[in-house]
């Protein structure tokens, strides 16, 4: 007899064809003979089966010979063998109907897990496998767990379920709600204006919940809270701000900050917690500050930076057209006694730069 | 709720091919047929064909020979392509979902051929 | 082909009215009939089928009968939102096609 395999809540056709592409007599029962639906005249009659009232056939095929069943609203006990009885011969078809929902809500947090619970029909021993919108594949039997999820889960995932080498294919969208980034780096020379943003890497209709910026200065023993904030329905409201630095906050998304001055005693690292509404724990993303200052105090040219700087980075002082220069791995650079003209102060990684910085020095007569 | 949305070329000249793509969101695509229906002042509306999950089709026999739909089971898509054009092909074009009647359609798309 | 015609092409009634407007199969279909409802700028929607099953949604106001090659739409009493164009659909055989409208408007 001839498997077919059906989701949970879908529709799906039942085919029978019979020899001659004319009209005839049939019947569709299920496996305790009770009858579905059938002919009587032109007329489609239902039977006293339950699914009576989810199933059709296509008057329009009759003529053809073909003379299918359509269920609407798949169930998980609908799985049974149907009969069709047409020209004195019956065709069996059985009916497999398997589902495939996540346990917990499908908008979930970086870290948390998610499992996927396949139902089935008794009697019945699919497999799963499962493609993550990153490419992972994960196989399993009733269940599917993922551990931990990342910010790269988010999106459709595409689980086959296979059974008597027939296969059924669902797709589950999950959202995981995650900053885009996990980390991010401002450079800035000193005295100017620091924009931090965080942007979302998913959507909501309603997005409510509160928010803090804690800030660890590379310059203080200890963190402090710079901001405190709540989110209702994706207007952002300012709850409590620290003196200094008095930080500003934008009233939409992407939630963003602006510090008016880079000072030394800013940089450092900050770690932005955003909590939502009915949800369990709490998104982060990690932002960092590296100021820069050049200053020329006697015969002495500095190059200074502050913030976490990885060692591979490179400081550098250099006379503009001139090859002088002098650069070192190191958060601190100068030049005694430098030749007047104009230096440049530049931060750079593997040649890319980071952050520059120009400085006047002038002949001393 | 199933929603159809449909996109494709709204102008076009004589001899050119019309071309219409049909999304399905939020219901189910399999175990239904998919349609093409078109509606023109001089003809009101009159069905082209369709086509099912598995690719079978069945045409109106009036444009059997200019008509190709093709289904997409992946994306949950199906096309419609008409060759040969002519200012007679100029309608609104539906896509709808069908067992013996259409229960669900598109939002339309208005295709004009003009030299 | 099966060719529906429905009469009449336009009706004017007021608020209220009970209309009836009736479509002729040109060969027997049973009950493989539908109805269905159109506004401007509007793709049709489908109102009845079995020529007298109720899709989910439809006011109880219309009611579809008829058998064989004559069917009926009637509108027990109008309201602003009925006036509209109603067409005729047959699924008895391919091709499927569909009556020339019923124009109903405002007296």
């Known amino acids: 007899k001839k498997v077919v395999l059906g989701k949970k809540g879908d529709t799906v056709e039942l085919t029978c064809n019979a020899s001659q592409k004319k009209n005839t007599q049939f019947h569709w029962k299920n496996s305790n003979q009770i009858k579905i639906l059938g002919i009587q005249g032109l007329f489609l009659t239902k039977g006293p089966s339950k699914l009576s009232d989810r199933a059709d056939s296509r008057k329009s095929l009759w003529d053809q010979g073909c003379f299918s069943m359509i269920i609407k609203n798949l169930k998980i006990e609908d799985s049974d063998t149907y009969i069709c009885e047409v020209e004195n011969k019956k065709e069996e078809v059985e009916l497999l109907v398997f589902g495939l929902t996540a346990n917990s809500d499908t908008h979930l947090l970086e870290g948390q897990s998610l499992t996927l619970t396949l139902e089935s029909p008794p009697g019945s021993s699919p497999s799963v496998k499962c493609r993550s919108p990153g490419g992972k594949n994960i196989q399993g039997g009733r269940t599917i767990s993922v551990p931990q999820l990342e910010r790269q889960d988010s999106g459709t995932w595409t689980c086959t379920v296979s059974q008597d080498q027939k296969t059924v294919e669902f797709k589950i969208d999950i959202v995981v709600l995650a900053f885009q980034k996990a980390s991010s780096t401002v450079y800035k020379k000193e005295g100017e204006q620091v924009e931090f943003s965080f942007p979302l890497a998913f959507t909501l209709e309603k997005l409510t919940g509160s928010g803090e910026l804690w800030w660890q200065a590379e310059r203080a023993s200890s963190s402090k809270s710079w901001i405190t904030f709540d989110l209702k329905n994706k207007e952002v409201s300012v709850k409590r701000v620290t003196q200094d630095p008095k930080l500003q906050m934008g009233k939409k998304l992407p939630l963003h900050l602006t510090l008016p001055q880079a000072l030394p005693q800013y940089a450092g690292s900050g770690n932005l917690t955003l909590a939502l509404e009915a949800k369990t724990g709490k998104l982060h993303q990690e932002v960092n500050l590296v100021v820069m200052r050049a200053t020329q105090f006697q015969e002495n040219l500095t190059c200074e930076v502050w913030g976490p700087t990885s060692p591979k980075l490179t400081l550098s002082l250099k006379l503009e057209n001139k090859g002088a220069t002098v650069s070192k791995q190191a958060k601190a650079v100068w030049v005694l006694n430098p030749e007047a003209g104009m230096w440049q102060c530049l931060l750079s990684d593997s040649g890319q730069v980071l952050l520059e910085s120009n400085i006047k020095v002038v002949p001393t007569w | 709720q199933v929603q159809l949305q449909q996109w494709g070329a709204g102008l076009l000249k004589p001899s050119e091919t019309l071309s219409l793509t049909c999304a399905v969101y939020?219901?189910?695509?399999?175990?239904?047929?998919w349609s093409w229906i078109r509606q023109s002042p001089g003809k009101g509306l009159e069905w082209i064909g369709e086509?099912?999950?598995?690719?079978?089709?069945n045409y109106n026999p009036s444009l059997k020979s200019r008509v190709t739909i093709s289904v997409d089971t992946s994306k949950d898509q199906f096309s419609l392509k008409l060759s040969s054009v002519t200012a007679a092909d100029t309608a609104v074009y539906y896509c709808?979902?069908?067992?013996?009647?259409?229960?669900?359609w598109g939002q339309g798309s208005l295709v004009t051929v003009s030299s | 082909d099966i060719q529906m015609t429905q009469s009449p092409s336009s009706v004017s009634a007021s608020v209220g009215d009970r209309v009836t407007i009736t479509c002729r199969a040109s060969?027997?279909?049973?009950?493989?009939l539908a109805w269905y409802q159109q506004k401007p700028g509007n793709a049709p929607k489908l109102l009845i089928y079995?020529?007298?099953s109720f899709q989910s949604g439809v006011p109880s106001r219309f009611s579809g009968s008829g058998s064989g090659t004559d069917f009926t739409l009637t509108i027990s009493s109008l309201q602003t939102e009925d006036f509209a164009t109603y067409y005729c659909?047959?699924?008895?055989?391919?091709?499927?096609?569909f009556g020339q409208g019923t124009k109903l408007e405002i007296k």
């Open positions: 709808a979902r069908v067992i013996n009647w259409f229960d669900s």
């Open positions: 939020g219901g189910s695509f399999s175990g239904y047929y």
């Open positions: 086509i099912n999950q598995s690719g079978s089709t």
């Open positions: 060969q027997g279909i049973s009950s493989w």
């Open positions: 079995d020529a007298s």
């Open positions: 659909q047959q699924a008895n055989s391919f091709p499927y096609t």
